[in-house]
C-alpha cells in the first residue's frame, strides 16, 4: 500500500527575469527513492538518479540548476514559463508519487507565493 504523501510549493508566482525554486518533499513512507524527475507539462526538465546523479535536459541547461536538495531552480523566467510543473518520485517498493506545482510568471513587480498544499 502506498502510504507516502508529497508536499509541494503549491501555486506560486514570480517576476519575469527572476528565479524561483520548485520543491517537493516525499514523506510518510519508508520506500527507497530511486529517481526524481522534474517535468513541465510533457517536457522533461531534469532527473536526479540514485546511481547517476543529476541530468539537466540540454534545452534547459542554461536556465535550470539543481537544488537545493532534490528541488529545482528556474532562472531568467519568461512569461512562457507559466504553467504546470511536476515532480515524480520513483520509489521501491511503493511505485510512483507525483506532485504538482503551478507557476505563474508575472510582468508586474507584485509576485506573491501561494500556500503550500499536500497531494496524497
Amino acid at each position: 500500500m502506498m502510504t507516502g504523501t508529497i508536499e509541494t510549493t503549491g501555486n506560486i508566482s514570480a517576476e519575469k527575469g527572476g528565479s524561483i525554486i520548485l520543491q517537493c518533499h516525499l514523506s510518510s513512507t519508508t520506500a527507497q527513492v530511486t529517481q526524481v524527475n522534474w517535468e513541465q507539462q510533457d517536457q522533461l526538465l531534469a532527473i536526479c538518479n540514485a546511481d547517476l546523479g543529476w541530468h539537466i535536459s540540454p534545452s534547459f541547461k542554461d536556465r535550470v540548476a539543481p537544488g537545493p536538495g532534490l528541488g529545482l531552480t528556474l532562472q531568467s523566467l519568461t512569461v512562457n514559463d507559466t504553467g504546470e510543473y511536476f515532480c515524480i518520485y520513483h520509489t521501491y517498493p511503493d511505485g510512483t508519487y507525483t506532485g504538482r506545482i503551478f507557476l505563474e510568471v508575472l510582468e508586474s513587480s507584485v509576485a506573491e507565493h501561494g500556500a503550500r498544499f499536500q497531494i496524497p
Epitope: E7, I21, Q23, H25, L26, S27, T30, V33, T34, Q35, V36, C48, N49, A50, L52, G53, W54, H55, I56, K61, A65, P66, G67, P68, G69, L70
Partner: antibody
Framework: QVQLQQPGSELVRPGASVKLSCKAS????????IHWVKQRHGQGLEWIGN????????NYDERFKNMGTLTVDTSSNTAYMDLSSLTSEDSAVYYC??????????WGQGTTLTVSS | DIVLTQSPATLSVTPGDSVSLSCRAS??????LHWFQQKSHESPRLLIN???QSISGIPSRFRGGGSGTDFTLSINSLETEDFGMYFC?????????FGGGTKLEIK
C-alpha cells in the same frame, strides 16, 4: 569505486592564500554537487559552499563569501577552493563531499590547513 | 539561515542500550534532514538520508524519523563501534547548515 581525493595537509603563512583541491573519480563529475565543509579542531561541521560542475553554479554561506572562491576543472575532474587573507582562525580540516540523490554520501579524507608563521 | 539544534550535547550510555538523538530546526524544513556519524580522525559518514531513508551498508539499528522541525535518530542496542559524534544537516535551503553535534560516549 567513488573517491574524493584531498591532500593530507597544507602549511601557509598568515595573510597568504591557498588553493585546496578535491579530485573526483569513479563517477560522472559533472552530475553531482561538490560541497566544502570546515571543521576546526574538536569542533562541529560548518558548511562553506557548493558548486555544480555541470554548470559552474555555486552557493556560499555569507560568512565565507569574502574569503574563498569555488571553482572546478572538468577536464581533470577536480574541484578547488581558493582561500585568501588567511588567519589562524582558518586553521582547520577542510572536507569536500558530493551530493546527488543522497546528501553527502561520499567525503574526501580532508585537508588539514595550518596557518602559522 | 536555518539553525539546527541538537540535544543532548553529550550522552553517556552503555553498549546494549538504545538511544534517541534529537535535531530541531528553527523553521519547517519538511524532510530535508540528514544524519551523519563521525569518529575521531575520520570523515563523516552518511547514516540517514531525507529524515528516514536508510542507506546501503548502514546497520538496520540506525533509524531516522520526524519531519517539519523535529527529528530523531534512534540507535537500537548500541554497539561499541557506534560511539562518536553525530551531526544533522539540512538541505531544504541554501545555505545548508549543520547541527552542533551530539557526542555519544561510553558510560
Amino acid at each position: 569505486q567513488v573517491q574524493l581525493q584531498q591532500p593530507g595537509s597544507e602549511l601557509v603563512r598568515p595573510g597568504a592564500s591557498v588553493k585546496l583541491s578535491c579530485k573526483a573519480s569513479g563517477y560522472t563529475f559533472t552530475s553531482y554537487w561538490i560541497h566544502w565543509v570546515k571543521q576546526r579542531h574538536g569542533q562541529g561541521l560548518e558548511w562553506i559552499g557548493n558548486i555544480f560542475p555541470g554548470s559552474g553554479t555555486s552557493n556560499y554561506d555569507e560568512r565565507f563569501k569574502n574569503m574563498g572562491t569555488l571553482t572546478v576543472d572538468t577536464s581533470s575532474n577536480t574541484a578547488y577552493m581558493d582561500l585568501s587573507s588567511l588567519t589562524s582562525e582558518d586553521s582547520a580540516v577542510y572536507y569536500c563531499a558530493r551530493e546527488g540523490l543522497y546528501a553527502f554520501d561520499y567525503w574526501g579524507q580532508g585537508t588539514t590547513l595550518t596557518v602559522s608563521s | 539561515d536555518i539553525v539546527l539544534t541538537q540535544s543532548p550535547a553529550t550522552l553517556s550510555v552503555t553498549p546494549g542500550d538504545s538511544v534517541s538523538l534529537s535535531c530541531r530546526a528553527s523553521q519547517n524544513i519538511r524532510n530535508s534532514l540528514h544524519w551523519f556519524q563521525q569518529k575521531s580522525h575520520e570523515s563523516p559518514r552518511l547514516l540517514i538520508n531525507y529524515a528516514s531513508q536508510s542507506i546501503s551498508g548502514i546497520p538496520s539499528r540506525f533509524r531516522g524519523g520526524g519531519s517539519g522541525t523535529d527529528f530523531t535518530l534512534s540507535i537500537n542496542s548500541l554497539e561499541t563501534e557506534d560511539f562518536g559524534m553525530y551531526f544533522c544537516l539540512q538541505s531544504n535551503s541554501w545555505p545548508y547548515t549543520f547541527g552542533g553535534g551530539t557526542k555519544l560516549e561510553i558510560k
